[in-house]
Interface confidence: low
């Protein structure tokens, strides 16, 4: 004859207010004959939760049909959970006796505790933009969860980060907890399209972690590189000079041309293009009139990017006598 075992597989059951909780209990033997009852707590003060034979338990239903002859599943469901329902629940086997049944064996118990889901993580980046190769900090916060155990991870474009510090408050007992984590991220020049993700995993989320994101485009400034070149072709008595501003972010840019130190107010042609990495290129063309009186022309392309100090590149125009004498429209 197999010895009866009372199996309650969950040590801890986390439930949320208003939901239904399932308390599992199975037996390994049909003997001895007698009922299985559910209690909360132990000792003389324990509270009867369910008795199939007698009593009225409107919030409790059984998972299996207890009237079936060979039933060995005595699991129950408790609906509309409230904070008053927390405690340790025991399924207890009684041996049929006279005048009354005698307690025979108890299950190990399942502790029912209230769980609360964490709020969606909010990720905040630095207040000011920073250039590549520098480290910036991102903070992630989530609130209102219980129990206290929680896992927080940081990712950059899917790669897990290791340089972060996390605190869960309060340290003592509480009905709800908050988590705050600060991650340090080194910026790369191609991070305009990058994301940092804060991921929070909690037992109440049933395997679907919550994520908060921040775009590194809001934290990064990629300063431009400048190149000024004289085009070999000319149109009539004009020479075309190009200022190429490459690989900058954000788009905010002011470009001015100077001729021999004098700022030129006239319109210049320009184009803006976006690179695959999210940075921008800006090309500006400046037409310089060639005349006998203009032997030494120094052109300056000055760029002010995203409110930073202006940077500039100079070009001393090379105008040969041969070029001055040409009258065709397009001569090398």
């Amino acid at each position: 004859e197999e010895e009866l075992q009372m199996i309650q597989p969950e040590k801890l059951l986390l439930v949320t207010v208003g939901k239904t909780a399932t308390l599992h209990c199975t037996v390994t033997s049909l003997l001895p004959v007698g009922p299985v009852l559910w209690f909360r707590g132990v000792g003389p003060g324990r509270e009867l939760i369910y008795n199939q034979k007698e009593g009225h338990f409107p919030r409790v239903t059984t998972v299996s049909d207890l009237t079936k002859r060979n039933n060995m599943d005595f699991s129950i469901r408790i609906s509309s959970i409230t904070p008053a329902d927390v405690g340790t629940y025991y399924c207890v086997k009684f041996r049929k006796g006279s005048p009354e049944n005698v307690e025979f064996k108890s299950g190990p118990g399942t502790e029912m505790a209230l769980g609360a889901k964490p709020s969606a993580p909010v990720v905040l980046g630095p207040a000011a933009r920073t250039t590549p190769e520098h480290t910036v900090s991102f903070t992630c916060e989530s609130h209102g969860f219980s129990p206290r155990d929680i896992t927080l991870k940081w990712f950059k474009n899917g790669n897990e980060l290791s340089d972060f510090q996390t605190n869960v408050d309060p340290t003592g007992q509480s009905v709800a907890y908050s988590i705050r984590s600060t991650a340090r991220v080194v910026l790369d020049p191609w991070d305009v399209r990058s994301q940092v993700i804060c991921e929070v995993a909690h037992v109440t989320l049933q395997g679907d972690p919550l994520r908060g994101t921040a775009n590194l485009s809001e934290a990064i400034r990629v300063p431009p590189t400048l190149e000024v070149t004289q085009q070999p072709m000319r149109v009539g008595n004009q020479v075309n000079v190009t200022c190429q501003v490459r690989k900058f972010y954000p788009q905010s840019l002011q470009l001015t041309w100077s001729e021999n130190g004098n700022v030129c107010q006239r319109e210049t042609a320009s184009t803006l293009t976006e690179n695959k990495d999210g940075t921008y290129n800006w090309t500006s063309w400046f037409l310089v009139n060639i005349s006998d009186q203009r032997d030494d022309v120094v052109l300056t392309c000055q760029v002010k990017h995203d409110g930073q100090l202006a940077v500039s590149k100079r070009l001393a125009l090379e105008v040969t006598v041969h070029q001055k004498d040409q009258s065709s429209d397009a001569t090398p």
Partner: nanobody, 126 residues
């Protein structure tokens, strides 16, 4: 609900091998870090090995390194413990456990597990 079931235990001679399996039918074992623990008579339960959700991260207690291998088949929602070169001191009830709060790459510390199976007996004796 979490229903972990271990299998593969039994009686084996010293130097022999066993493969334990841990499966579940009620939830997605492939979404959690999973560990193997053991409890010998009169001793405390100790962590033996653990594996991250992805399977890329594993950890072993010193006494089993080089002899035991933990692995997982996420398609079958099963975690295995291959035990080679078994010794009498490996005799214990072996438990499988899942850490419901750990995800992705981490292999949890042995104190973090919060869902347990019923255990399977492993006896190493000649």
């Amino acid at each position: 609900q979490v229903q972990l079931v271990e299998s593969g235990g039994g009686l084996v001679q010293p130097g022999g091998s066993l493969r334990l399996s841990c499966a579940d039918s009620e939830f997605r074992l492939d979404e959690y870090a999973t560990g193997w623990f053991r409890q010998a008579p009169g001793k405390e339960r100790e962590g033996v090995a653990c594996i991250s959700r992805s399977g890329s991260n594993t950890k072993y207690t010193d006494s089993v390194k080089g002899r035991f291998t933990i692995s997982r088949d996420n398609a079958k929602k099963t975690v295995y413990l291959q035990m080679n070169s078994l010794k009498p001191e490996d005799t214990a009830v072996y438990y499988c456990a899942a850490d419901l709060t750990s995800h992705y790459l981490s292999c949890s510390s042995y104190t973090d597990y919060n869902s347990w199976g019923q255990g399977t007996q492993v006896t190493v004796s000649s």
